[in-house]
Interface confidence: medium
């Protein structure tokens, strides 16, 4: 004969546990139904009646099968430096992540507690390490032969164009200016010179020249921790 199916509430066999999506109620000493995600236990079970579940109220949730008397409160609204990547529903908490241009300086179990703006590398400095969701940008001085003329959290140092005739030599914060339209590959000994790249980046207008003080090998070493303020600007 097939085993009889027990309906909640029921007394478990000695030494056995309740089934999936059931819990053992210590007061009733019975196996009782859990409430589904998005619900909570409004009335606990007795020896003769099963758990009575009710929907979570607005701004509260339960994510798991449960028998909690009250739903959990959703987290506070996302701050201005965050975006809501998961809305508060009856079944899930609100998740806030940092908006573009920011990174998570202090994370929590899900989402971010504190966002901070990504460091911007000033002209003469380029991105050595791009920002991630949880780490800031690292800037580095543009090496001889390269430049950055932007204040940006994404731009790397770019190569100077190589001129047939140089009108204005390039430096760390400005491209070379040519008097001829056809660049050549002639190079000054010891300088780092590169061609214009095949690039999808937009070209920027050039600021007033400023001398490069970057040591010639500063960008060539494997990147370790970098002084946060070097070559960077706040928002």
């Amino acid at each position: 004969l097939p085993a009889q199916v027990a309906f909640t509430p029921y007394a478990p066999e000695p030494g056995s546990t309740c089934r999936l999506r059931e819990y053992y109620d210590q007061t009733a000493q019975m196996c009782c139904s859990k409430c589904s995600p998005g619900q909570h236990a409004k009335v606990f079970c007795t020896k003769t009646s099963d758990t009575v579940c009710d929907s979570c109220e607005d701004s509260t949730y339960t994510q798991l099968w449960n028998w909690v008397p009250e739903c959990l409160s959703c987290g506070s609204r996302c701050s201005s430096d965050q975006v809501e990547t998961q809305a508060c529903t009856r079944e899930q908490n609100r998740i806030c992540t940092c908006r573009p241009g920011w990174y998570c300086a202090l994370s929590k179990q899900e989402g971010c507690r504190l966002c901070a703006p990504l460091r911007k590398c000033r002209p003469g400095f380029g991105v050595a390490r791009p920002g991630t969701e949880t780490s800031d940008v690292v800037c580095k001085p543009c090496a001889p032969g390269t430049f950055s003329n932007t204040t940006s959290s994404t731009d790397i140092c770019r190569p100077h164009q190589i001129c047939n005739v140089v009108a204005i030599p390039g430096n760390a914060s400005m491209d070379a200016v040519c008097t001829s339209t056809s660049p050549t590959r002639s190079m000054a000994p010891g300088a780092v010179h590169l061609p214009q790249p095949v690039s999808t980046r937009s070209q920027h207008t050039q600021p007033t020249p400023e001398p490069s003080t970057a040591p010639s090998t500063s960008f060539l070493l494997p990147m370790g921790p970098s002084p946060p303020a070097e070559g960077s600007t706040g928002d």
Partner: antibody, heavy 121, light 107 residues
Amino acid sequence: QVQLVESGGGVVHPGKSLRLSCAASGFTFNIYGMHWVRQAPGKGLEWVALISYDGNDKYFADSVKGRFTISRDNSKNTLYLQMNSLRAEDTAVYYCAKAVDTAVVTFFDYWGQGTLVTVSS
Amino acid sequence: EIVMTQSPVTLSVSPGERATLSCRASQSVSSNLAWYQQKPGQAPRLLIYSASTRATGIPARFSGSGSGTEFTLTISSLQSEDLAVYYCQQYSNWPFTFGPGTKVDIK
């Protein structure tokens, strides 16, 4: 540990195309420039192409300019080299190599094992 | 482009002896020079960068020196596993260029 695994090599006729791939693992792929370097049989090393960490800046050796393109898919940790209009002199082992940082001028701290491309009629 | 030359083409050294390899640039590359080791059937491996800085995990018997146009790689006490071709590479000027290599044989 850092691993670079090239694939896509083979025998191809002159004028035809081939696409090489390099699967990267063991490091944060999307913050490093990546390069292709080749080595003809019994010969030395020749730098071929470089792509910046974000894929926006690309550089090529004169010998392949206009025929080869380099690209990357940071979501798949994969580097590509599309080789068109192949010539006999493109026959070589092609290595992908990791740049030491995002700088456009750099040396290579890790190399793949290489994939052989043979261009022959 | 900067042309890199290496000498000798082949170097035969007994185990335990010193091996000295030379690399010359056609114009100054400051100290922007790297050395690579390529064992038979293997990919190149970075040994030295910035002319004299040993890469991670490289034994102390390998050392680099020089700046400008003249560079030297020294293996102070040659081991049998050092049988390889050694390449220098400049990364000061465009395009990146390698030397033709020096093959180190065990006598």
